[in-house]
Interface confidence: medium
Protein backbone atom coordinates (compact mmCIF):
# COMPACT_ATOMS: atom_id res chain seq x y z
CA UNK A 1 0.00 0.00 0.00
CA UNK A 2 1.07 3.54 -0.49
CA UNK A 3 -0.34 6.41 1.43
CA UNK A 4 -1.75 8.72 -1.22
CA UNK A 5 -2.95 12.25 -0.55
CA UNK A 6 -1.07 12.58 2.68
CA UNK A 7 2.18 14.44 2.96
CA UNK A 8 5.06 13.60 5.28
CA UNK A 9 7.44 16.28 6.53
CA UNK A 10 10.89 14.78 6.99
CA UNK A 11 13.25 16.79 9.20
CA UNK A 12 16.82 15.81 8.40
CA UNK A 13 20.03 17.01 9.99
CA UNK A 14 20.95 19.19 7.03
CA UNK A 15 20.79 22.88 6.26
CA UNK A 16 18.00 22.23 3.77
CA UNK A 17 14.37 23.12 4.58
CA UNK A 18 12.12 20.26 5.77
CA UNK A 19 11.47 17.72 3.04
CA UNK A 20 7.83 17.11 2.16
CA UNK A 21 7.01 13.67 0.80
CA UNK A 22 3.71 12.45 -0.61
CA UNK A 23 4.64 8.83 0.12
CA UNK A 24 6.09 7.74 3.44
CA UNK A 25 7.93 4.87 1.75
CA UNK A 26 10.18 7.39 -0.03
CA UNK A 27 11.83 7.74 3.40
CA UNK A 28 12.51 4.02 3.83
CA UNK A 29 16.13 2.93 4.00
CA UNK A 30 17.20 1.18 0.78
CA UNK A 31 16.79 -2.53 1.50
CA UNK A 32 18.59 -5.08 -0.64
CA UNK A 33 16.48 -7.91 0.80
CA UNK A 34 17.57 -11.42 1.76
CA UNK A 35 18.28 -12.79 -1.72
CA UNK A 36 21.62 -12.70 -3.46
CA UNK A 37 20.89 -11.49 -6.96
CA UNK A 38 22.65 -8.37 -8.22
CA UNK A 39 19.98 -6.10 -9.65
CA UNK A 40 20.42 -2.39 -10.32
CA UNK A 41 17.55 -0.47 -8.77
CA UNK A 42 16.92 3.11 -7.60
CA UNK A 43 15.82 4.58 -4.27
CA UNK A 44 15.03 8.05 -2.97
CA UNK A 45 17.67 9.32 -0.55
CA UNK A 46 16.05 11.69 1.97
CA UNK A 47 19.42 13.22 2.84
CA UNK A 48 20.62 14.09 -0.67
CA UNK A 49 16.97 14.52 -1.80
CA UNK A 50 17.79 12.69 -4.98
CA UNK A 51 17.10 9.32 -6.53
CA UNK A 52 20.18 7.13 -6.37
CA UNK A 53 21.27 3.72 -7.51
CA UNK A 54 21.57 0.70 -5.22
CA UNK A 55 21.98 -3.06 -5.61
CA UNK A 56 18.87 -5.13 -4.88
CA UNK A 57 19.07 -8.83 -4.04
CA UNK A 58 15.96 -9.73 -5.99
CA UNK A 59 13.39 -10.46 -3.28
CA UNK A 60 11.95 -8.87 -0.15
CA UNK A 61 13.03 -5.32 0.52
CA UNK A 62 10.60 -2.41 0.69
CA UNK A 63 8.72 0.03 -1.52
CA UNK A 64 11.57 2.56 -1.79
CA UNK A 65 12.80 0.64 -4.82
CA UNK A 66 12.25 1.55 -8.45
CA UNK A 67 13.20 -0.01 -11.76
CA UNK A 68 14.30 3.30 -13.27
CA UNK A 69 15.56 6.71 -12.22
CA UNK A 70 12.52 8.22 -13.95
CA UNK A 71 10.02 6.18 -11.94
CA UNK A 72 11.82 7.07 -8.70
CA UNK A 73 11.75 10.77 -9.55
CA UNK A 74 8.11 10.61 -10.59
CA UNK A 75 7.01 9.08 -7.29
CA UNK A 76 9.33 10.68 -4.75
CA UNK A 77 10.77 13.99 -5.89
CA UNK A 78 9.61 17.47 -5.12
CA UNK A 79 8.30 18.11 -8.64
CA UNK A 80 5.66 15.47 -8.08
CA UNK A 81 4.77 16.89 -4.65
CA UNK A 82 4.41 20.39 -6.12
CA UNK A 83 2.06 19.09 -8.78
CA UNK A 84 -0.19 17.41 -6.22
CA UNK A 85 -0.17 20.44 -3.89
CA UNK A 86 -0.97 22.70 -6.83
CA UNK A 87 -3.92 20.46 -7.67
CA UNK A 88 -5.18 20.74 -4.11
CA UNK A 89 -4.77 24.52 -4.07
CA UNK A 90 -6.79 24.77 -7.26
CA UNK A 91 -9.42 22.56 -5.60
CA UNK A 92 -9.24 20.23 -8.59
CA UNK A 93 -10.01 16.59 -8.14
CA UNK A 94 -7.13 14.18 -8.79
CA UNK A 95 -7.43 12.50 -12.18
CA UNK A 96 -8.17 9.12 -10.62
CA UNK A 97 -11.49 10.43 -9.25
CA UNK A 98 -12.77 10.24 -12.83
CA UNK A 99 -11.86 6.59 -13.31
CA UNK A 100 -14.77 4.16 -13.42
CA UNK A 101 -15.35 1.83 -10.50
CA UNK A 102 -13.06 -1.13 -11.01
CA UNK A 103 -13.56 -4.31 -8.98
CA UNK A 104 -10.37 -5.87 -10.38
CA UNK A 105 -10.26 -9.51 -11.38
CA UNK A 106 -10.21 -11.27 -8.03
CA UNK A 107 -13.22 -12.51 -6.09
CA UNK A 108 -12.71 -11.12 -2.60
CA UNK A 109 -15.81 -8.88 -2.60
CA UNK A 110 -14.63 -6.23 -0.15
CA UNK A 111 -16.76 -3.14 0.48
CA UNK A 112 -14.99 -0.04 -0.84
CA UNK A 113 -15.99 3.44 -2.01
CA UNK A 114 -15.47 5.20 -5.32
CA UNK A 115 -16.31 8.62 -6.70
CA UNK A 116 -19.13 8.41 -9.25
CA UNK A 117 -18.58 11.19 -11.75
CA UNK A 118 -22.20 10.91 -12.95
CA UNK A 119 -23.82 11.45 -9.56
CA UNK A 120 -20.89 13.60 -8.31
CA UNK A 121 -20.95 11.57 -5.11
CA UNK A 122 -18.94 8.85 -3.43
CA UNK A 123 -20.69 5.51 -3.55
CA UNK A 124 -20.15 2.02 -2.24
CA UNK A 125 -18.96 -0.79 -4.51
CA UNK A 126 -17.68 -4.33 -4.19
CA UNK A 127 -13.94 -4.65 -4.77
CA UNK A 128 -12.50 -8.04 -5.65
CA UNK A 129 -9.34 -7.57 -3.62
CA UNK A 130 -6.69 -7.24 -6.31
CA UNK A 131 -5.73 -4.99 -9.21
CA UNK A 132 -8.40 -2.35 -9.89
CA UNK A 133 -7.53 1.35 -9.93
CA UNK A 134 -6.96 4.29 -7.57
CA UNK A 135 -10.62 5.34 -7.42
CA UNK A 136 -10.92 2.96 -4.51
CA UNK A 137 -11.19 4.06 -0.88
CA UNK A 138 -11.51 2.16 2.37
CA UNK A 139 -13.94 4.68 3.87
CA UNK A 140 -16.64 7.01 2.59
CA UNK A 141 -14.90 9.90 4.39
CA UNK A 142 -11.61 9.30 2.55
CA UNK A 143 -13.46 9.25 -0.75
CA UNK A 144 -15.34 12.46 0.03
CA UNK A 145 -12.21 14.26 1.25
CA UNK A 146 -10.35 13.32 -1.91
CA UNK A 147 -12.91 13.54 -4.68
CA UNK A 148 -16.12 15.36 -3.73
CA UNK A 149 -16.50 19.12 -4.11
CA UNK A 150 -16.17 20.78 -0.72
CA UNK A 151 -14.03 17.86 0.41
CA UNK A 152 -15.82 16.75 3.57
CA UNK A 153 -14.81 17.85 7.07
CA UNK A 154 -12.02 20.42 6.92
CA UNK A 155 -10.76 19.16 3.59
CA UNK A 156 -8.21 21.02 1.52
CA UNK A 157 -4.48 21.12 2.04
CA UNK A 158 -4.66 21.20 5.84
CA UNK A 159 -5.51 17.52 5.89
CA UNK A 160 -2.50 16.69 3.76
CA UNK A 161 0.22 17.97 6.04
CA UNK A 162 1.37 15.91 8.97
CA UNK A 163 4.78 16.67 10.47
CA UNK A 164 6.99 13.87 11.74
CA UNK A 165 10.53 14.12 13.07
CA UNK A 166 12.16 11.00 11.73
CA UNK A 167 15.36 9.84 10.16
CA UNK A 168 15.03 6.75 7.98
CA UNK A 169 11.82 4.78 8.25
CA UNK A 170 12.77 1.15 8.79
CA UNK A 171 10.65 -0.21 5.98
CA UNK A 172 7.15 -0.06 7.42
CA UNK A 173 4.66 2.78 7.28
CA UNK A 174 4.69 5.41 10.03
CA UNK A 175 2.35 4.83 12.96
CA UNK A 176 -0.87 6.46 11.95
CA UNK A 177 -3.91 5.40 9.95
CA UNK A 178 -3.20 4.70 6.32
CA UNK A 179 -5.31 6.20 3.62
CA UNK A 180 -6.06 4.95 0.29
CA UNK A 181 -5.01 1.78 -1.48
CA UNK A 182 -3.02 2.37 -4.61
CA UNK A 183 -3.54 -0.39 -7.19
CA UNK A 184 -2.11 -0.64 -10.66
Amino acid sequence: DSEEDEEYTIITDTELPPLKLMHSFCAFKPDDGPCKAIMKRFFFNIFTRQCEEFIYGGCGGNQNRFESMEECKKVCTRDNVNRIIQTALQKEKPDFCFLEEDPGICRGYITRYFYNNQSKQCERFKYGGCLGNMNNFETLEECKNTCEDGGGSGGGLNDIFEAQKIEWHEGGPPHHHHHHHHHH
Epitope: I105, R107, G129, G132
Partner: antibody, heavy 118, light 113 residues
Framework: EVQLVESGGGLVQPGGSLRLSCAAS????????MSWVRQAPGKGLEWVSA????????YYADSVKGRFTISRDNSKNTLYLQMNSLRAEDTAVYYC???????????WGQGTLVTVSS | QSVLTQPPSLSGAPGQRVTISCTGS?????????VQWYQQLPGTAPKLLIF???NRPSGVPDRFSGSRSGTSASLAITGLQAEDEANYYC????????????FGGGTKLTVLG
Protein backbone atom coordinates in the same frame (compact mmCIF):
# COMPACT_ATOMS: atom_id res chain seq x y z
CA GLU B 1 -16.26 -28.52 -21.72
CA VAL B 2 -14.09 -25.40 -21.26
CA GLN B 3 -11.56 -24.93 -24.02
CA LEU B 4 -8.96 -22.21 -24.56
CA VAL B 5 -6.91 -22.38 -27.75
CA GLU B 6 -4.04 -19.97 -28.33
CA SER B 7 -2.59 -19.09 -31.73
CA GLY B 8 -0.32 -16.51 -33.35
CA GLY B 9 3.03 -17.49 -31.87
CA GLY B 10 6.17 -17.78 -33.94
CA LEU B 11 9.64 -16.44 -34.60
CA VAL B 12 10.07 -12.67 -34.62
CA GLN B 13 13.09 -10.37 -34.64
CA PRO B 14 13.89 -8.07 -31.70
CA GLY B 15 11.86 -4.88 -32.03
CA GLY B 16 9.18 -6.69 -34.00
CA SER B 17 5.49 -7.24 -33.28
CA LEU B 18 3.18 -10.19 -32.92
CA ARG B 19 -0.50 -10.63 -32.10
CA LEU B 20 -1.65 -13.62 -30.11
CA SER B 21 -5.25 -14.85 -30.06
CA CYS B 22 -7.09 -17.13 -27.66
CA ALA B 23 -10.37 -18.69 -28.78
CA ALA B 24 -12.62 -19.60 -25.84
CA SER B 25 -15.56 -22.00 -25.67
CA UNK B 26 -17.58 -23.92 -23.11
CA UNK B 27 -18.28 -21.01 -20.74
CA UNK B 28 -19.86 -17.55 -20.76
CA UNK B 29 -16.81 -15.69 -21.99
CA UNK B 30 -18.01 -12.16 -21.19
CA UNK B 31 -18.56 -13.08 -17.52
CA UNK B 32 -14.92 -13.85 -16.86
CA UNK B 33 -11.78 -11.81 -16.55
CA MET B 34 -9.01 -13.31 -18.66
CA SER B 35 -5.24 -13.28 -18.33
CA TRP B 36 -2.08 -14.01 -20.26
CA VAL B 37 0.65 -15.87 -18.38
CA ARG B 38 3.99 -16.77 -19.90
CA GLN B 39 6.76 -19.28 -19.25
CA ALA B 40 10.27 -18.82 -20.60
CA PRO B 41 11.98 -22.07 -21.66
CA GLY B 42 12.96 -24.06 -18.57
CA LYS B 43 11.74 -21.29 -16.25
CA GLY B 44 8.76 -20.54 -14.02
CA LEU B 45 5.43 -18.86 -14.66
CA GLU B 46 5.07 -15.09 -15.03
CA TRP B 47 1.79 -13.16 -15.16
CA VAL B 48 1.74 -10.80 -18.14
CA SER B 49 -1.63 -9.09 -18.37
CA ALA B 50 -5.30 -9.30 -17.45
CA UNK B 51 -8.59 -7.84 -18.67
CA UNK B 52 -12.00 -7.58 -17.03
CA UNK B 53 -15.01 -9.41 -18.45
CA UNK B 54 -16.36 -6.30 -20.16
CA UNK B 55 -12.94 -5.31 -21.44
CA UNK B 56 -13.23 -1.97 -19.65
CA UNK B 57 -10.27 -2.55 -17.32
CA UNK B 58 -6.82 -3.78 -18.30
CA TYR B 59 -3.77 -4.59 -16.19
CA TYR B 60 -0.13 -5.25 -17.03
CA ALA B 61 3.04 -6.54 -15.42
CA ASP B 62 5.76 -3.88 -15.22
CA SER B 63 7.93 -5.90 -17.62
CA VAL B 64 5.48 -5.43 -20.51
CA LYS B 65 3.78 -2.13 -19.65
CA GLY B 66 3.74 0.23 -22.64
CA ARG B 67 4.71 -2.54 -25.09
CA PHE B 68 1.87 -5.08 -24.84
CA THR B 69 -1.87 -4.46 -25.19
CA ILE B 70 -4.54 -6.88 -24.04
CA SER B 71 -8.01 -6.77 -25.58
CA ARG B 72 -11.04 -8.98 -26.12
CA ASP B 73 -13.93 -9.37 -28.53
CA ASN B 74 -16.83 -10.82 -26.55
CA SER B 75 -18.90 -11.28 -29.69
CA LYS B 76 -16.20 -13.64 -31.01
CA ASN B 77 -15.27 -15.18 -27.64
CA THR B 78 -11.69 -14.24 -28.33
CA LEU B 79 -8.88 -12.76 -26.23
CA TYR B 80 -5.92 -10.96 -27.82
CA LEU B 81 -2.42 -9.88 -26.88
CA GLN B 82 -0.74 -7.33 -29.15
CA MET B 83 3.00 -7.47 -28.50
CA ASN B 84 5.19 -4.63 -29.79
CA SER B 85 8.88 -3.78 -29.35
CA LEU B 86 9.62 -7.41 -28.60
CA ARG B 87 12.82 -8.33 -26.77
CA ALA B 88 14.78 -11.56 -26.42
CA GLU B 89 13.52 -11.86 -22.85
CA ASP B 90 9.93 -12.05 -24.11
CA THR B 91 10.71 -15.49 -25.55
CA ALA B 92 8.28 -17.85 -23.84
CA VAL B 93 5.24 -20.04 -24.14
CA TYR B 94 2.23 -17.75 -23.73
CA TYR B 95 -0.85 -19.20 -22.06
CA CYS B 96 -4.29 -17.66 -21.87
CA UNK B 97 -6.28 -18.49 -18.75
CA UNK B 98 -9.63 -17.56 -17.29
CA UNK B 99 -9.98 -16.02 -13.87
CA UNK B 100 -12.56 -17.91 -11.89
CA UNK B 101 -12.59 -18.52 -8.16
CA UNK B 102 -10.57 -16.20 -5.92
CA UNK B 103 -7.45 -14.93 -7.71
CA UNK B 104 -7.07 -18.27 -9.43
CA UNK B 105 -6.79 -19.25 -13.08
CA UNK B 106 -9.28 -22.10 -13.44
CA UNK B 107 -8.55 -23.15 -16.99
CA TRP B 108 -5.51 -22.75 -19.20
CA GLY B 109 -4.91 -23.12 -22.91
CA GLN B 110 -2.17 -25.34 -24.29
CA GLY B 111 0.09 -22.35 -24.94
CA THR B 112 1.72 -20.81 -28.01
CA LEU B 113 5.48 -20.35 -28.34
CA VAL B 114 6.89 -16.91 -29.08
CA THR B 115 10.58 -16.79 -30.00
CA VAL B 116 12.32 -13.43 -30.25
CA SER B 117 15.66 -13.83 -31.96
CA SER B 118 17.73 -12.31 -34.74
CA GLN C 1 14.11 -13.98 -8.53
CA SER C 2 10.47 -14.65 -7.73
CA VAL C 3 8.35 -12.63 -5.30
CA LEU C 4 7.23 -15.87 -3.61
CA THR C 5 9.97 -18.29 -2.56
CA GLN C 6 9.69 -22.06 -3.02
CA PRO C 7 12.30 -24.80 -2.64
CA PRO C 8 13.61 -25.63 -6.14
CA SER C 9 13.26 -29.37 -5.67
CA LEU C 10 11.84 -32.01 -3.36
CA SER C 11 11.57 -35.76 -3.51
CA GLY C 12 9.62 -38.49 -1.78
CA ALA C 13 8.91 -42.18 -2.03
CA PRO C 14 5.52 -43.52 -3.14
CA GLY C 15 3.03 -43.46 -0.28
CA GLN C 16 4.92 -40.76 1.61
CA ARG C 17 3.68 -37.30 2.62
CA VAL C 18 5.51 -34.28 1.22
CA THR C 19 5.03 -30.58 1.94
CA ILE C 20 6.00 -27.78 -0.43
CA SER C 21 6.49 -24.38 1.21
CA CYS C 22 5.85 -20.94 -0.27
CA THR C 23 7.21 -17.90 1.55
CA GLY C 24 6.05 -14.38 0.80
CA SER C 25 6.09 -11.01 2.52
CA UNK C 26 3.86 -8.41 4.14
CA UNK C 27 2.72 -7.14 0.73
CA UNK C 28 1.33 -10.47 -0.50
CA UNK C 29 0.62 -13.47 1.72
CA UNK C 30 1.11 -11.37 4.86
CA UNK C 31 -1.47 -8.88 3.57
CA UNK C 32 -4.10 -11.63 3.70
CA UNK C 33 -4.18 -12.33 -0.04
CA UNK C 34 -5.19 -15.83 -1.06
CA VAL C 35 -2.68 -18.33 -2.32
CA GLN C 36 -3.26 -20.74 -5.19
CA TRP C 37 -1.30 -23.81 -6.21
CA TYR C 38 -0.80 -25.15 -9.74
CA GLN C 39 0.55 -28.46 -10.95
CA GLN C 40 2.42 -28.59 -14.25
CA LEU C 41 3.13 -32.02 -15.62
CA PRO C 42 6.04 -32.24 -18.10
CA GLY C 43 5.16 -30.71 -21.47
CA THR C 44 1.66 -29.58 -20.44
CA ALA C 45 -0.11 -26.41 -19.33
CA PRO C 46 -0.47 -25.66 -15.61
CA LYS C 47 -3.55 -27.04 -13.83
CA LEU C 48 -5.26 -25.42 -10.84
CA LEU C 49 -4.80 -27.62 -7.79
CA ILE C 50 -5.78 -25.41 -4.82
CA PHE C 51 -7.48 -22.01 -4.76
CA UNK C 52 -8.30 -19.63 -1.93
CA UNK C 53 -5.58 -21.16 0.31
CA UNK C 54 -7.25 -24.52 0.93
CA ASN C 55 -10.03 -25.21 -1.60
CA ARG C 56 -9.84 -27.97 -4.19
CA PRO C 57 -11.53 -27.63 -7.59
CA SER C 58 -13.70 -30.60 -8.51
CA GLY C 59 -11.65 -33.49 -9.81
CA VAL C 60 -8.60 -32.80 -7.65
CA PRO C 61 -7.99 -35.70 -5.23
CA ASP C 62 -8.22 -35.01 -1.49
CA ARG C 63 -4.61 -36.17 -1.18
CA PHE C 64 -3.81 -32.52 -2.02
CA SER C 65 -4.39 -29.88 0.64
CA GLY C 66 -3.29 -26.29 1.16
CA SER C 67 -2.86 -23.90 4.06
CA ARG C 68 -1.69 -20.36 4.68
CA SER C 69 -0.46 -18.67 7.84
CA GLY C 70 1.13 -15.24 8.07
CA THR C 71 3.58 -14.77 5.24
CA SER C 72 3.83 -18.48 4.43
CA ALA C 73 1.74 -21.09 2.68
CA SER C 74 2.17 -24.78 2.06
CA LEU C 75 0.90 -27.56 -0.17
CA ALA C 76 0.72 -31.03 1.34
CA ILE C 77 0.52 -34.19 -0.75
CA THR C 78 -0.24 -37.42 1.09
CA GLY C 79 0.01 -40.94 -0.32
CA LEU C 80 2.49 -39.81 -2.96
CA GLN C 81 1.98 -41.42 -6.37
CA ALA C 82 4.19 -41.67 -9.44
CA GLU C 83 1.84 -39.40 -11.41
CA ASP C 84 2.41 -36.59 -8.86
CA GLU C 85 5.88 -36.04 -10.31
CA ALA C 86 5.60 -32.50 -11.68
CA ASN C 87 6.43 -28.86 -11.09
CA TYR C 88 4.30 -27.10 -8.48
CA TYR C 89 3.80 -23.32 -8.34
CA CYS C 90 2.27 -21.12 -5.67
CA UNK C 91 0.60 -17.88 -6.77
CA UNK C 92 -0.90 -14.84 -5.06
CA UNK C 93 -1.38 -11.10 -5.45
CA UNK C 94 1.13 -8.46 -4.40
CA UNK C 95 -0.18 -5.03 -3.46
CA UNK C 96 3.17 -3.22 -3.65
CA UNK C 97 3.58 -0.08 -5.73
CA UNK C 98 3.07 -1.87 -9.04
CA UNK C 99 0.46 -4.35 -7.86
CA UNK C 100 0.39 -7.61 -9.76
CA UNK C 101 -0.30 -11.32 -9.71
CA UNK C 102 2.84 -13.12 -8.56
CA PHE C 103 4.20 -16.66 -8.64
CA GLY C 104 6.72 -18.70 -6.75
CA GLY C 105 9.70 -19.98 -8.70
CA GLY C 106 8.30 -23.49 -8.76
CA THR C 107 9.23 -26.74 -7.04
CA LYS C 108 10.21 -29.83 -9.01
CA LEU C 109 8.77 -32.83 -7.16
CA THR C 110 10.42 -36.16 -7.90
CA VAL C 111 8.75 -39.41 -6.89
CA LEU C 112 11.48 -41.90 -6.11
CA GLY C 113 11.01 -45.22 -7.73
Amino acid sequence: EVQLVESGGGLVQPGGSLRLSCAASGFTFSSYAMSWVRQAPGKGLEWVSAISGSGGSTYYADSVKGRFTISRDNSKNTLYLQMNSLRAEDTAVYYCANNGAAAAWDYWGQGTLVTVSS
Amino acid sequence: QSVLTQPPSLSGAPGQRVTISCTGSSSNLGADYDVQWYQQLPGTAPKLLIFGNNNRPSGVPDRFSGSRSGTSASLAITGLQAEDEANYYCQSYDRSLSGSMVFGGGTKLTVLG
